[in-house]
Interface confidence: medium
């Protein structure tokens, strides 16, 4: 089952997921698509990463993560209510059928009529289970994380400060995580 | 221009090899998943084969599993069909598709290529 | 090979709409959404329906899909002579991990 995001009409969603290059600037192609992962690829793609660079972008859909450290986290700029919806995170790893899918809901919230008096920081607070699976080829053992029900109800004041703060760790922790190597 | 040209058919014996190849210009071809489809003399469609953008996942229809290997040739935008052990019911035009949606979307096809297996 | 159940042939008069359907199961289009093609006779299939219901860019919107359970249909509504073809509905199975087309469907215009 997907695991929920939520942003409020006119902010900056948020959908996490990470990788762990094998090495440095060993990077995996990686793809966004909006609905739920399909066989092959990422349906309705927004977002696709190569073995170099963003490759591939649409309007409003950004990295804002060091995406060449493996923070392919997805920003979706200004959402509407038509933003709601699963998307898919897709890591491509290269091995015999060894791609990462991630299903992530975004649940896009009316804005509110009075701003918030303080930012939203809470995020749930359970860990989540961790799973070790034997890789095919380069990837040897793959640490999955379970991802959280996060509520991000205030993103686009948060999107800077996630990169350097206490909350980047918690999200990397947290979110939809595959080591490789 | 988006495309996919086809080459590689011909007749063979019971038994016997075909390559196939499939050209691609026009799009990122690395991006998209590839699928090799099949039409015998007046019959419908069946899905022989499909390939991930990668390379790295390959799926297979039970009538050619370990007589077919599809693969792909990212650097040269080039799709592959080795057909082994080729039976008489292999008989049939064999086209390569485009999957864009990779739900099995073939939005863009090759002209298609005439596969015959008579002795 | 397993294929998707349609009707071997369907027709109507210029101008009538015809609808076409397609039945599977739980694996495939129970789960999965269903695709449908046209083939015009010696020529390679072209894409119809994609999703269940979206039309790629350049199909008429005459052309229209739906998918309930495990079945699924394509109606053609302003039917004209040269949408006579062969009609085939598919989807990824997920039990057989196969791409299953359906039997198709002939396409008279009377």
């Known amino acids: 089952s997907e695991v929920e995001y939520r942003a409020e009409v006119g902010q900056n969603a948020y959908l996490p997921c990470f990788y762990t290059p094998a090495a440095p600037g060993n990077l995996v192609p990686v793809c966004w698509g909006k609905g739920a992962c399909p066989v092959f690829e990422c349906g309705n793609v927004v977002l696709r990463t190569d073995e170099r660079d963003v490759n591939y972008w649409t309007s409003r859909y950004w990295l804002n993560g060091d995406f060449r450290k493996g923070d392919v986290s997805l920003t979706i700029e200004n959402v509407t209510l038509a933003d709601s919806g699963i998307y898919c995170c897709r890591i491509q790893i290269p091995g015999i059928m060894n791609d990462e899918k991630f299903n992530l809901k975004l649940v896009i919230k009316p804005a509110k009529v009075t701003p918030a008096p303080t930012r939203q920081r809470d995020f749930t607070a359970a860990f989540p289970r961790m799973l070790t699976t034997r890789g095919h080829g380069p990837a040897e053992t793959q640490t999955l994380g379970s991802l959280p029900d996060i509520n991000l109800t205030q993103i686009s004041t948060l999107a800077n400060e996630l990169r350097d703060s206490r909350l980047a760790n918690d999200l990397r922790d947290s979110g939809a995580t595959i080591r490789i190597g | 221009q988006v495309q996919l040209v086809q080459s590689g058919g011909g007749l063979v014996q019971p038994g016997g090899s075909l390559r196939l190849s499939c050209a691609a210009s026009g799009f990122t071809f690395s991006s998209y998943a590839m699928s090799w489809v099949r039409q015998a003399p007046g019959k419908g469609l069946e899905w022989v084969s499909a390939?991930?953008?990668?390379?790295?996942?390959?799926y297979y229809a039970d009538s050619v599993k370990g007589r077919f290997t599809i693969s792909r040739d990212n650097s040269k935008n080039t799709l592959l069909l080795q057909m082994n052990s080729l039976r008489v019911e292999d008989t049939a035009v064999y086209y390569c598709?485009?999957?864009?949606?990779?739900?099995?979307?073939?939005?863009?096809w090759g002209q298609g290529t005439m596969v015959t297996v008579s002795s | 090979n397993f294929m998707l159940t349609q009707p071997p042939s369907a027709s109507g008069t210029p101008g009538q709409r015809v609808t076409i359907s397609c039945s599977g199961s739980?694996?495939?289009?129970?789960?999965?959404?269903v695709n449908w093609y046209q083939q015009l006779p010696g020529t390679a299939p072209k894409l119809l329906i994609y999703?269940?219901?979206q039309r790629p860019s350049g199909v008429p919107a005459r052309f229209s899909g739906s998918k309930s359970g495990t079945s699924a249909s394509l109606a053609i509504s302003g039917l004209q002579s040269e949408q006579e073809a062969d009609y085939y509905c598919a989807a990824w199975d997920d039990s057989l991990n196969n791409y299953v087309f359906g039997t198709g469907t002939k396409v008279t215009v009377l």
């Open positions: 999703s269940n219901n």
């Open positions: 390939i991930s953008g990668s390379g790295g996942s390959t």
């Open positions: 598709a485009r999957d864009f949606s990779g739900w099995g979307g073939f939005d863009i």
């Open positions: 739980s694996s495939n289009i129970g789960s999965n959404t």
